[in-house]
Protein backbone atom coordinates (compact mmCIF):
# COMPACT_ATOMS: atom_id res chain seq x y z
CA UNK A 1 0.00 0.00 0.00
CA UNK A 2 0.88 3.77 -0.83
CA UNK A 3 1.01 5.73 2.04
CA UNK A 4 1.53 8.84 0.03
CA UNK A 5 -2.00 10.07 0.45
CA UNK A 6 -3.02 9.70 3.41
CA UNK A 7 -4.03 12.31 6.15
CA UNK A 8 -0.92 12.23 8.21
CA UNK A 9 -2.16 14.89 10.93
CA UNK A 10 -5.26 12.65 11.69
CA UNK A 11 -2.97 9.70 12.26
CA UNK A 12 -0.64 11.80 14.19
CA UNK A 13 -3.59 13.10 16.08
CA UNK A 14 -5.02 9.52 16.53
CA UNK A 15 -1.99 8.23 17.85
CA UNK A 16 -0.83 11.59 20.26
CA UNK A 17 -4.55 10.73 21.45
CA UNK A 18 -4.62 7.18 22.34
CA UNK A 19 -2.13 4.63 20.35
CA UNK A 20 0.84 6.64 22.53
CA UNK A 21 -0.95 5.19 25.88
CA UNK A 22 -1.36 1.70 24.42
CA UNK A 23 1.99 1.18 23.33
CA UNK A 24 3.13 2.97 26.98
CA UNK A 25 0.77 0.11 28.92
CA UNK A 26 2.28 -2.70 26.61
CA UNK A 27 5.97 -1.58 27.11
CA UNK A 28 5.48 -1.00 30.86
CA UNK A 29 7.64 -2.23 33.00
CA UNK A 30 10.40 -2.11 30.20
CA UNK A 31 13.54 0.19 30.27
CA UNK A 32 14.04 2.90 27.59
CA UNK A 33 17.48 2.09 26.86
CA UNK A 34 16.81 -1.31 27.05
CA UNK A 35 17.11 -2.21 23.08
CA UNK A 36 18.64 -0.64 20.36
CA UNK A 37 17.00 0.66 17.73
CA UNK A 38 17.51 -0.62 14.28
CA UNK A 39 14.57 0.29 12.11
CA UNK A 40 13.91 3.93 10.77
CA UNK A 41 11.91 5.49 8.45
CA UNK A 42 13.09 8.75 6.44
CA UNK A 43 9.41 10.38 5.72
CA UNK A 44 6.21 10.05 6.90
CA UNK A 45 4.98 7.63 3.77
CA UNK A 46 7.67 5.48 4.96
CA UNK A 47 7.40 5.82 8.52
CA UNK A 48 3.71 4.62 8.17
CA UNK A 49 5.15 1.55 6.17
CA UNK A 50 7.70 0.32 8.75
CA UNK A 51 4.85 0.71 11.29
CA UNK A 52 2.50 -0.97 9.49
CA UNK A 53 5.07 -3.81 8.83
CA UNK A 54 6.34 -3.99 12.33
CA UNK A 55 2.75 -3.54 13.91
CA UNK A 56 0.93 -6.56 11.57
CA UNK A 57 3.90 -9.02 10.26
CA UNK A 58 4.61 -11.56 12.45
CA UNK A 59 8.19 -12.17 12.99
CA UNK A 60 10.49 -14.65 14.20
CA UNK A 61 9.72 -14.77 18.23
CA UNK A 62 6.85 -12.29 17.91
CA UNK A 63 3.32 -13.50 16.39
CA UNK A 64 1.23 -11.78 17.89
CA UNK A 65 0.97 -8.05 17.74
CA UNK A 66 -1.68 -7.97 15.98
CA UNK A 67 -4.19 -8.36 18.57
CA UNK A 68 -2.89 -5.82 20.50
CA UNK A 69 -4.72 -2.95 21.64
CA UNK A 70 -2.73 -0.15 20.13
CA UNK A 71 -2.14 -2.44 16.59
CA UNK A 72 -6.47 -2.02 16.69
CA UNK A 73 -6.57 1.18 16.94
CA UNK A 74 -3.68 1.82 14.51
CA UNK A 75 -5.17 -0.53 12.17
CA UNK A 76 -8.82 1.17 12.56
CA UNK A 77 -7.05 4.85 12.14
CA UNK A 78 -4.99 3.86 8.60
CA UNK A 79 -8.26 2.70 7.58
CA UNK A 80 -9.90 6.11 8.47
CA UNK A 81 -7.35 8.26 7.09
CA UNK A 82 -5.54 6.43 4.23
CA UNK A 83 -8.19 5.92 1.22
CA UNK A 84 -7.99 2.73 -0.09
CA UNK A 85 -6.17 1.21 2.61
CA UNK A 86 -8.99 -1.23 4.12
CA UNK A 87 -9.62 -2.74 0.61
CA UNK A 88 -5.79 -3.64 0.69
CA UNK A 89 -5.84 -5.27 3.85
CA UNK A 90 -8.42 -7.97 3.42
CA UNK A 91 -6.41 -10.54 2.60
CA UNK A 92 -3.71 -9.91 4.88
CA UNK A 93 -6.36 -9.86 7.98
CA UNK A 94 -7.73 -13.26 6.58
CA UNK A 95 -4.13 -14.72 6.34
CA UNK A 96 -3.71 -12.66 9.80
CA UNK A 97 -6.41 -14.91 11.43
CA UNK A 98 -4.95 -18.29 10.44
CA UNK A 99 -1.68 -17.54 11.80
CA UNK A 100 -3.22 -16.37 15.09
CA UNK A 101 -1.65 -17.94 18.02
CA UNK A 102 -2.47 -17.21 21.89
CA UNK A 103 -0.94 -13.84 23.25
CA UNK A 104 2.20 -13.78 24.38
CA UNK A 105 4.25 -10.92 25.55
CA UNK A 106 7.68 -11.97 24.64
CA UNK A 107 11.48 -9.94 24.83
CA UNK A 108 11.19 -10.22 21.06
CA UNK A 109 7.94 -8.35 21.15
CA UNK A 110 9.06 -5.59 23.51
CA UNK A 111 11.90 -5.12 21.34
CA UNK A 112 9.42 -4.55 18.34
CA UNK A 113 7.52 -2.24 20.08
CA UNK A 114 10.04 -0.56 21.32
CA UNK A 115 11.28 -0.11 17.60
CA UNK A 116 7.38 1.13 17.02
CA UNK A 117 7.45 4.03 19.54
CA UNK A 118 10.51 5.29 17.52
CA UNK A 119 8.70 5.10 14.49
CA UNK A 120 6.17 6.94 15.49
CA UNK A 121 7.95 9.77 17.14
CA UNK A 122 9.29 9.76 13.93
CA UNK A 123 6.33 10.21 11.94
CA UNK A 124 5.02 12.97 14.06
CA UNK A 125 8.24 15.15 14.04
CA UNK A 126 10.00 14.63 10.60
CA UNK A 127 12.04 17.73 10.33
CA UNK A 128 10.58 19.24 7.89
CA UNK A 129 12.20 21.51 4.95
CA UNK A 130 11.38 24.71 5.37
CA UNK A 131 10.59 27.70 2.53
CA UNK A 132 14.07 28.77 1.27
CA UNK A 133 15.71 25.82 2.59
CA UNK A 134 17.50 23.28 0.84
CA UNK A 135 18.84 21.37 3.02
CA UNK A 136 16.58 18.69 3.50
CA UNK A 137 15.84 15.53 1.42
CA UNK A 138 12.97 14.11 1.81
CA UNK A 139 9.61 15.81 0.50
CA UNK A 140 6.50 14.24 1.33
CA UNK A 141 4.44 16.63 3.07
CA UNK A 142 3.91 19.43 0.39
CA UNK A 143 0.48 18.83 0.56
CA UNK A 144 0.23 19.98 4.75
CA UNK A 145 1.59 22.40 5.40
CA UNK A 146 0.67 22.61 9.43
CA UNK A 147 2.85 19.53 9.61
CA UNK A 148 3.91 20.08 13.37
CA UNK B 1 17.19 8.57 33.73
CA UNK B 2 17.42 10.64 30.09
CA UNK B 3 20.45 13.07 30.76
CA UNK B 4 22.10 15.97 28.52
CA UNK B 5 25.88 17.09 29.07
CA UNK B 6 27.02 20.34 27.80
CA UNK B 7 30.72 21.28 27.00
CA UNK B 8 32.19 24.49 29.27
CA UNK B 9 32.27 27.95 28.89
CA UNK B 10 33.82 29.52 25.79
CA UNK B 11 35.23 33.09 25.52
CA UNK B 12 35.55 34.33 21.54
CA UNK B 13 37.04 36.34 19.65
CA UNK B 14 34.44 38.18 17.29
CA UNK B 15 34.51 36.64 13.63
CA UNK B 16 35.71 33.58 15.44
CA UNK B 17 33.44 29.49 15.49
CA UNK B 18 32.54 28.24 18.48
CA UNK B 19 31.62 24.33 18.79
CA UNK B 20 29.55 23.79 21.79
CA UNK B 21 29.06 19.67 22.51
CA UNK B 22 26.10 17.73 24.36
CA UNK B 23 26.21 14.26 25.10
CA UNK B 24 23.12 12.53 25.73
CA UNK B 25 22.79 8.86 28.14
CA UNK B 26 19.92 6.67 29.19
CA UNK B 27 17.58 7.07 25.97
CA UNK B 28 17.97 6.02 22.65
CA UNK B 29 19.91 8.59 20.87
CA UNK B 30 19.18 8.31 17.76
CA UNK B 31 15.46 8.27 17.60
CA UNK B 32 15.01 11.56 19.14
CA UNK B 33 14.87 15.08 17.24
CA UNK B 34 17.43 17.22 19.48
CA UNK B 35 17.29 21.05 19.41
CA UNK B 36 19.44 23.97 20.19
CA UNK B 37 18.21 27.01 21.87
CA UNK B 38 19.64 30.22 22.94
CA UNK B 39 19.42 32.34 25.58
CA UNK B 40 21.35 36.13 25.32
CA UNK B 41 21.79 37.89 28.83
CA UNK B 42 18.37 38.82 30.70
CA UNK B 43 16.38 38.20 27.14
CA UNK B 44 14.38 35.46 26.10
CA UNK B 45 14.42 31.99 24.26
CA UNK B 46 15.54 31.60 21.21
CA UNK B 47 15.56 28.17 18.24
CA UNK B 48 18.66 27.67 16.25
CA UNK B 49 17.58 24.16 14.98
CA UNK B 50 17.32 20.78 15.31
CA UNK B 51 18.73 17.29 13.97
CA UNK B 52 17.46 13.80 13.97
CA UNK B 53 20.38 11.67 14.99
CA UNK B 54 19.02 8.65 13.05
CA UNK B 55 20.27 10.28 9.61
CA UNK B 56 21.60 13.43 10.29
CA UNK B 57 18.92 15.50 9.02
CA UNK B 58 18.47 18.71 10.07
CA UNK B 59 15.46 21.98 10.36
CA UNK B 60 17.41 25.58 10.80
CA UNK B 61 15.48 28.82 11.98
CA UNK B 62 16.14 31.17 9.16
CA UNK B 63 18.47 33.44 11.11
CA UNK B 64 21.04 31.39 12.21
CA UNK B 65 20.77 29.21 8.81
CA UNK B 66 23.96 30.43 7.24
CA UNK B 67 26.10 30.40 10.32
CA UNK B 68 24.99 27.70 12.11
CA UNK B 69 25.58 23.86 11.93
CA UNK B 70 24.14 20.99 13.47
CA UNK B 71 26.26 17.76 13.75
CA UNK B 72 26.30 14.56 15.67
CA UNK B 73 28.52 11.53 16.44
CA UNK B 74 26.10 8.77 16.91
CA UNK B 75 29.31 6.63 18.41
CA UNK B 76 29.89 8.69 20.86
CA UNK B 77 26.00 9.99 21.28
CA UNK B 78 26.93 13.32 20.63
CA UNK B 79 25.13 16.53 19.67
CA UNK B 80 27.26 19.64 18.60
CA UNK B 81 26.32 22.99 17.74
CA UNK B 82 28.61 25.46 15.75
CA UNK B 83 27.87 28.79 14.73
CA UNK B 84 30.50 30.89 12.63
CA UNK B 85 31.01 34.16 12.41
CA UNK B 86 30.97 35.50 16.04
CA UNK B 87 29.32 38.68 16.82
CA UNK B 88 28.75 40.06 20.46
CA UNK B 89 25.24 39.63 19.90
CA UNK B 90 26.04 36.04 19.77
CA UNK B 91 26.79 36.19 23.81
CA UNK B 92 24.10 33.44 24.89
CA UNK B 93 23.81 30.57 27.05
CA UNK B 94 23.32 28.01 24.53
CA UNK B 95 21.05 24.66 25.30
CA UNK B 96 20.65 21.49 23.70
CA UNK B 97 17.25 19.99 24.51
CA UNK B 98 15.57 16.56 23.37
CA UNK B 99 12.59 16.27 21.92
CA UNK B 100 9.50 14.45 23.91
CA UNK B 101 9.12 10.76 23.80
CA UNK B 102 5.55 11.09 21.34
CA UNK B 103 6.40 14.00 18.96
CA UNK B 104 4.33 16.18 20.86
CA UNK B 105 7.20 18.66 19.84
CA UNK B 106 7.99 19.70 23.65
CA UNK B 107 11.29 19.53 25.47
CA UNK B 108 11.36 17.22 28.29
CA UNK B 109 15.48 16.97 28.96
CA UNK B 110 17.68 19.74 28.92
CA UNK B 111 21.41 20.11 29.30
CA UNK B 112 22.26 22.59 31.70
CA UNK B 113 23.92 25.26 28.85
CA UNK B 114 27.08 26.76 27.89
CA UNK B 115 27.65 30.36 28.23
CA UNK B 116 29.40 31.71 25.46
CA UNK B 117 30.72 35.08 25.63
CA UNK B 118 31.82 37.18 22.52
CA UNK B 119 34.53 39.54 23.32
CA UNK B 120 37.33 41.96 21.85
CA UNK C 1 6.37 32.67 11.43
CA UNK C 2 4.35 32.68 14.25
CA UNK C 3 4.63 35.36 17.12
CA UNK C 4 3.53 34.76 20.23
CA UNK C 5 3.15 37.23 23.01
CA UNK C 6 2.82 36.67 26.30
CA UNK C 7 1.05 38.91 28.78
CA UNK C 8 1.69 41.17 31.32
CA UNK C 9 5.47 41.70 30.73
CA UNK C 10 5.86 40.99 34.72
CA UNK C 11 3.28 40.16 37.12
CA UNK C 12 3.75 40.80 41.25
CA UNK C 13 1.61 38.83 43.10
CA UNK C 14 2.02 37.10 46.74
CA UNK C 15 2.37 34.07 47.84
CA UNK C 16 -1.00 32.25 48.17
CA UNK C 17 -2.52 34.96 44.84
CA UNK C 18 -3.95 33.13 41.90
CA UNK C 19 -1.52 33.80 38.92
CA UNK C 20 -2.98 33.87 34.80
CA UNK C 21 -0.44 34.06 32.35
CA UNK C 22 -1.47 34.70 28.88
CA UNK C 23 -0.17 33.71 25.73
CA UNK C 24 -1.75 34.85 22.42
CA UNK C 25 -0.52 33.64 19.03
CA UNK C 26 -0.56 35.30 15.62
CA UNK C 27 -2.13 32.65 13.84
CA UNK C 28 -3.54 29.17 14.99
CA UNK C 29 -1.36 26.55 16.50
CA UNK C 30 -3.99 23.76 16.52
CA UNK C 31 -4.15 20.82 13.81
CA UNK C 32 -6.60 18.06 13.55
CA UNK C 33 -7.87 18.95 17.08
CA UNK C 34 -4.78 19.47 19.08
CA UNK C 35 -3.41 22.20 20.08
CA UNK C 36 0.82 22.15 19.89
CA UNK C 37 1.29 24.82 22.59
CA UNK C 38 3.44 23.95 25.82
CA UNK C 39 4.49 25.84 28.73
CA UNK C 40 7.96 25.83 30.48
CA UNK C 41 9.01 27.87 33.82
CA UNK C 42 12.83 29.10 34.32
CA UNK C 43 14.37 30.12 37.15
CA UNK C 44 17.94 31.96 37.47
CA UNK C 45 20.76 29.69 36.25
CA UNK C 46 19.08 26.82 35.25
CA UNK C 47 17.85 25.68 32.09
CA UNK C 48 13.80 26.32 31.45
CA UNK C 49 11.44 23.09 32.55
CA UNK C 50 8.47 21.63 30.97
CA UNK C 51 5.26 22.91 32.82
CA UNK C 52 2.57 21.73 30.39
CA UNK C 53 2.16 20.05 26.76
CA UNK C 54 -0.42 20.83 24.52
CA UNK C 55 -2.17 23.31 25.95
CA UNK C 56 -3.49 21.58 29.41
CA UNK C 57 -1.22 18.42 30.14
CA UNK C 58 0.65 18.59 33.15
CA UNK C 59 4.76 17.89 32.93
CA UNK C 60 5.89 14.71 34.57
CA UNK C 61 6.11 15.93 38.39
CA UNK C 62 4.42 19.08 37.81
CA UNK C 63 2.24 19.95 40.85
CA UNK C 64 -1.56 20.29 40.34
CA UNK C 65 -1.83 23.65 40.85
CA UNK C 66 -0.69 24.35 37.92
CA UNK C 67 -3.11 24.50 34.72
CA UNK C 68 -3.53 25.48 31.24
CA UNK C 69 -6.22 26.42 28.96
CA UNK C 70 -7.21 27.60 25.31
CA UNK C 71 -7.24 26.68 21.85
CA UNK C 72 -6.45 28.08 18.39
CA UNK C 73 -4.81 31.40 19.20
CA UNK C 74 -5.43 32.51 22.91
CA UNK C 75 -3.72 30.49 25.68
CA UNK C 76 -3.87 30.63 29.83
CA UNK C 77 -1.39 29.23 31.98
CA UNK C 78 -2.91 29.54 35.66
CA UNK C 79 -1.32 28.34 38.78
CA UNK C 80 -4.37 28.10 41.75
CA UNK C 81 -2.26 29.23 44.82
CA UNK C 82 1.24 30.39 44.33
CA UNK C 83 3.95 29.08 46.35
CA UNK C 84 7.68 30.47 46.77
CA UNK C 85 9.35 28.53 44.47
CA UNK C 86 6.88 29.55 41.50
CA UNK C 87 8.37 32.81 41.08
CA UNK C 88 10.12 32.90 37.93
CA UNK C 89 10.02 33.31 34.10
CA UNK C 90 7.64 31.81 31.96
CA UNK C 91 7.62 31.09 28.16
CA UNK C 92 5.00 29.56 25.74
CA UNK C 93 6.27 27.62 23.01
CA UNK C 94 4.38 26.68 19.76
CA UNK C 95 5.51 23.98 17.37
CA UNK C 96 2.95 23.57 15.13
CA UNK C 97 4.59 25.05 12.32
CA UNK C 98 8.11 26.18 12.18
CA UNK C 99 10.34 27.82 12.66
CA UNK C 100 9.59 26.65 16.31
CA UNK C 101 9.24 30.01 18.61
CA UNK C 102 9.35 30.67 22.14
CA UNK C 103 6.86 34.07 23.55
CA UNK C 104 9.04 36.76 25.41
CA UNK C 105 8.15 35.72 28.95
CA UNK C 106 6.38 36.64 31.57
CA UNK C 107 8.17 37.53 34.93
CA UNK C 108 5.99 36.37 38.01
CA UNK C 109 7.62 38.14 40.72
CA UNK C 110 6.80 38.33 44.75
CA UNK C 111 4.55 41.52 45.12
Known amino acids: YDFTNCDFEKIKAAYLSTISKDLITYMSGTKSTEFNNTVSCSNRPHCLTEIQSLTFNPTAGCASLAKEMFAMKTKAALAIWCPGYSETQINATQAMKKARKSKVTTNKCLEQVSQLQGLWRRFNRPLLKQQGSSDYKDDDDKHHHHHH | EAQLVQSGAEVKKPGSSVKVSCKASGFTFSTYNMHWVRQAPGQGLEWIGAIYPGNGETSYNQKFKDRATLTVDKSTRTAYMELSSLRSEDTAVYYCAREDDYGEGYFDVWGQGTTVTVSS | EIVLTQSPATLSLSPGERATLSCRAS??????????MHWYQQKPGQPPRLLLY???NLGSGIPARFSGSGSGTDFTLTISSLEPEDFAVYYC?????????FGQGTKLEIK
Open chain 3, 54 to 56: RAS
Open chain 3, 27 to 36: ESVDNSGLSF
Open chain 3, 93 to 101: QQINTDPLT
